[in-house]
């Protein structure tokens, strides 16, 4: 069977006026997954995103991440889109530097 990913979005200061947003998917099986940043619902071009490898996380499941740099104040336009085993979800950028919840998707 399949195990849906936990998806977590974080933000960190990058440089003046910019922030780096990172979307992490973990504890999923099988390893095939789509994880991408969208702006206004449109996928960002590949050259503006950085992807991590899909790696085993030691529990028979997998983890990966995608990051991009965006302008501070434009966070509302961006979402992380995940597709896995026929299911999908959309994840907003959290405001400020608050704690972030992991979202498990079925």
């Amino acid at each position: 069977g399949s195990v849906p990913p936990m998806v977590n979005v974080t933000r960190s200061e990058a440089s003046e006026g910019n922030i780096t947003v990172t979307c992490r998917a973990s504890s999923f099986y099988p390893r095939n997954i789509t994880l991408t940043w969208r702006q206004d619902g449109v996928s960002l071009s590949h050259d503006t995103q950085q992807w991590g490898d899909v790696l085993p996380d030691g529990n028979g499941t997998y983890q990966t991440w995608v990051a991009t740099r965006i302008c501070q104040g434009e966070e509302q336009r961006f979402t992380c889109y995940m597709e896995h085993s026929g299911n999908h979800s959309t994840h907003p950028v959290p405001s400020g530097n608050s704690h972030h919840h992991h979202h498990h998707h079925h």
């Epitope: 206004d40 449109v42 071009s45 999908h88």
Partner: antibody, heavy 118, light 108 residues
């Protein structure tokens, strides 16, 4: 086949409200944003706003923020545009469209003509 | 707001001729955010070219797009009868999303 089917033409009095529906099919409704655009007779295209059906986030063109309301009903996979305090200048064809993988508007509804006349 | 100015407003050409349509932006746009749409009378717009130069599904190879910064071009190498329509450029780089006012390609 991806399609977006809109509700029929409407005639409204100035000051009234109108609600236009858009029912997409052929893809997972919550996987793509729904955009709304209008086109006055003989004029160009004007973006009104969009809604992300999965998380319910709405982004408006500031020009329409006070009068436009975008909603979705996930149970029926339908998106709605409501425009209030109608005036004659709101006479236009209103389109819904789907956000694409690489462009803002990749599939369009057939359009709904809204006529505002006393 | 980024204003897109299309020129000419109307282009009168014969079938078989080459059409060159321009779209000029009031501020620089990344080429990833410039798209073109075609609209025929009584029909909805149709995505033609995305991200400056990529043909949308089903679009004939006689259409091409180019440009960068503030200046973008849509070219139809040899006009077919079904190409006579209005063409709009659109930017998705900054809010509000905006369209050009359109260029009408009509039969001469």
């Amino acid at each position: 086949e991806i399609q977006l089917v809109q509700s029929g033409a409407e005639v409204k009095k100035p000051g009234a409200s109108v609600k236009v529906s858009c029912k997409p099919s052929g893809y997972a409704f919550t996987s793509n944003n729904i955009y709304w655009v209008r086109q006055a007779p003989g004029q160009g295209l004007e973006w009104i706003g969009y809604i992300d059906p999965y998380i319910g986030r709405i982004i408006y063109n500031q020009q329409f923020k006070d009068r436009a309301t975008l909603t979705v009903d996930k149970s029926t996979s339908t998106a709605y545009l409501e425009l209030s305090s109608l005036r004659s200048e709101d006479t236009a064809v209103y389109y819904c469209s789907r956000s694409g993988e690489r462009s803002n508007f990749d599939y369009w509804g057939q359009g709904t003509l809204v006529t505002v006349s006393s | 707001e980024i204003v897109l100015t299309q020129s000419p407003a109307t282009l009168s050409l014969s079938p078989g001729e080459r059409a060159t349509l321009s779209c000029s932006a009031s501020s620089s746009i990344s080429s990833n955010y410039l798209h073109w749409y075609q609209q025929k009378p009584g029909q909805s717009p149709r995505l033609l070219i995305y991200r400056t130069s990529n043909l949308a599904s089903g679009v004939p190879a006689r259409f091409s797009g180019s440009g960068s910064g503030t200046d973008y071009t849509l070219t139809i190498s040899s006009l077919e009868p079904e190409d006579f329509a209005v063409y709009y450029c659109q930017q998705g780089g900054s809010l509000p999303l905006t369209f050009g006012q359109g260029t009408k390609v009509e039969i001469k």
